[in-house]
Amino acid sequence: DPVKPSRGPLVTCTCESPHCRGPTCQGAWCTVVLVREEGRHPQEHRGCGNLHRELCRGRPTEFVNHYCCDSHLCNRNVSLVLEATQTPSEQPGTDSQ
């Protein structure tokens, strides 16, 4: 959902996900999220971010990669990759700290 103007300058982003209400959205920043659930192909979602910017700083894992940018439609042509599958002893956590 668009945030209120009082929250600061908004950027227009490409929106491509099952929950998009249109081809673009407005938010504090733009996002691309690549997610692979167990037994499924990775899915790439584009949209807007307003909360928890710390997720933008998380390392890619074999299950998820978050990308954030701050300019008009900056998420439109970004393609992400996941980390190569690792052995259990090498697997990073998804915790962003």
Epitope: S6, R7, S17, H19, H45, L51, H52, E54, V64, T94
Partner: antibody, heavy 118, light 108 residues
Framework: QVQLQESGPGLVKPSQTLSLTCTVS??????????WNWIRQHPGKGLEWIGY???????YYNPSLKSRVTISVDTSKNQFSLKLSSVTAADTAVYYC??????????WGQGTTVTVSS | ENVLTQSPGTLSLSPGERATLSCRAS???????LAWYQQKPGQAPRLLIY???SGATGIPDRFSGSGSGTDFTLTISRLEPEDFAVYYC?????????FGQGTRLEIK
């Protein structure tokens, strides 16, 4: 409207792992507008944030609990879960799940009491 | 970590009076992501105010929030008997999320 419901054992033995599940009904846990949180409240005390998970599976935890906490999501069941390892009596509390958006934590479960005792 | 300090710890007032609760943050609250919750015994917290000053759905307009940066206020313009409870402020939207220690509003 969206409702949250916590479930899990009400009694856990010291040194064991506390496991709770929050079931989301009336809406999708996969929406990119929401973050799914666990909060607890010790008897007679204030609210303590435990951590959150995003639909992508990315998590963030309270630094004071990080070494013992795991939060996971099952989008197919519209559920997210909390695991807290190596529990002691100090982990006895009411545990809440809550939905967070730009509008704050607008939906909460009713809470479930967990007692740690042998 | 953004530490939130609420004052007073306990506020004793009578129905019909005006209540003013304070929440001070140790760091500026980004995007004014500051919320207020009401909690009654045996119940989950209930969202009252989000974004420092926006009223949550279904909340009576006697509840209002104000402030920005590090100083925030919850005002209840005219206390009703059901308003006596514990009130918490919360910084949300960036981690770690933190709560104030609470203000207990009791009947004088």
């Amino acid at each position: 409207q969206v409702q949250l419901q916590e479930s899990g054992p009400g009694l856990v033995k010291p040194s064991q792992t506390l496991s709770l599940t929050c079931t989301v009904s009336g809406g999708s846990i996969s929406s990119n507008d929401y973050y799914w949180n666990w909060i607890r409240q010790h008897p007679g005390k204030g609210l303590e944030w435990i951590g959150y998970i995003y639909y992508s599976g990315s998590t963030y935890y309270n630094p004071s609990l990080k070494s013992r906490v795991t939060i996971s999501v099952d989008t197919s069941k519209n559920q997210f879960s909390l695991k807290l390892s190596s529990v002691t009596a100090a982990d006895t509390a009411v545990y809440y799940c809550a939905r967070e958006s730009t509008d704050g934590m607008d939906v909460w479960g009713q809470g479930t009491t967990v007692t740690v005792s042998s | 970590e953004n530490v939130l300090t609420q004052s007073p710890g306990t506020l004793s007032l009578s129905p019909g009076e005006r209540a003013t609760l304070s929440c001070r943050a140790s760091q500026s609250v980004s995007s004014n992501y500051l919320a207020w919750y009401q909690q009654k015994p045996g119940q989950a917290p209930r969202l009252l105010i989000y974004g420092a000053s926006s009223g949550a759905t279904g909340i009576p307009d006697r509840f209002s929030g104000s402030g920005s940066g590090t100083d925030f206020t919850l005002t209840i313009s005219r206390l009703e008997p059901e308003d006596f409870a514990v009130y918490y402020c919360q910084h949300y939207g960036s981690s770690p999320i933190t709560f104030g220690q609470g203000t207990r509003l009791e009947i004088k």
